[in-house]
């Protein structure tokens, strides 16, 4: 099977307020039913659509994990905003999770950062002024897949 | 080469049961969102169910929720459809299908066949 681009994100429930879509597309906050004939609403704290979409249905709302704290709860427009707990911090690379920041500097370094949920402590060397995050230098990755081509379906 | 093998259909009495598999290879497969469509004698695509890349969500279309189930293991890249409770409306040939993210009208609408796509048949009759 192979397929156009895909849009933003997407749920059905019985018995939600129904409109029509306007130029095939309906607004946040809704999705399109199956046949394509009418706006169905989120359910307000289970699931939602941010854009003007044609999603078959509203995306579920995220839960925080334990460790994270709910910044914003889920509307039928806006998903749930989930921030890692003081004193840990969520990594670009690692967003699955947030992670203890370290308590100190390596030793010949002095602390220029603090702590936040989204980066750990920030070290620099006393003489160089040479920057260095608190974690030690991770193992270099080989990168042995491709990417996906984008959005094709069938073989 | 993007390859997507299905099996595990067959013919089955109303009331049965049907466990699908489609086995990935040539992408990687927990990075997609993955579907299952359908398509009954004559009829175009229908959307069945999808599944996000790490499967902790699944959606399904009005007429199978409650009765399929839609799973994936992306160590083994499989993706999986048990489908209970068969009924003759659910008679189609079944292919599964990669994306980048949840399925939308438009999209569904515009996909195709391809021609080496053999699909597994799904054959619910008494």
């Known amino acids: 099977i192979t397929q156009q681009d895909l849009a933003p994100q997407q749920r059905v429930a019985p018995q939600q307020k129904r409109s029509s879509p306007s130029e095939g597309l309906c607004p946040p906050g809704h999705h399109i039913s199956e046949d394509g004939r009418d706006c169905i609403s989120c359910k307000y704290g289970q699931d939602y659509s941010t854009h003007w979409n044609d999603l078959l249905f509203c995306l579920r709302c995220t839960r925080c994990d334990s460790g994270e704290v709910e910044l914003s709860p889920c509307t039928t427009t806006r998903n749930t905003v989930c921030q890692c707990e003081e004193g840990t911090f969520r990594e670009e690379d690692s967003p699955e999770m947030c992670r203890k920041c370290r308590t100190g500097c390596p030793r010949g370094m002095v602390k220029v950062g603090d702590c936040t949920p989204w980066s750990d402590i920030e070290c620099v060397h006393k003489e160089s002024g040479t920057k260095h995050s608190g974690e030690a230098p991770a193992v270099e990755e080989t990168v042995t897949s491709s990417p996906g081509t984008p959005a094709s379906p069938c073989s | 080469e993007v390859q997507l093998v299905e099996s595990g259909g067959g013919l089955v009495q109303p009331g049965g049961s049907l466990r699908l598999s489609c086995a990935a290879s040539?992408?990687?497969?927990?990075r997609y969102w993955m579907y299952w469509v359908r398509q009954a004698p004559g009829k175009g695509l229908e959307w069945?169910?999808?599944?996000?890349?790490?499967?902790?969500?699944?959606y399904y279309r009005d007429s199978v929720r409650g009765r399929f189930t839609i799973s994936r293991d992306n160590f083994k890249n499989t993706l999986y459809l048990q489908m209970n409770s068969l009924k003759s409306e659910d008679t189609a040939v079944y292919y599964c299908a990669k994306a980048e993210g949840p399925p939308t009208f438009s999209l569904i609408r515009t996909m195709t066949v391809d021609p080496g796509a053999q699909g597994t048949q799904v054959t619910v009759s008494s």
């Open positions: 069945v169910s999808a599944i996000n890349s790490g499967g902790g969500d699944t």
């Open positions: 040539g992408f990687t497969f927990s």
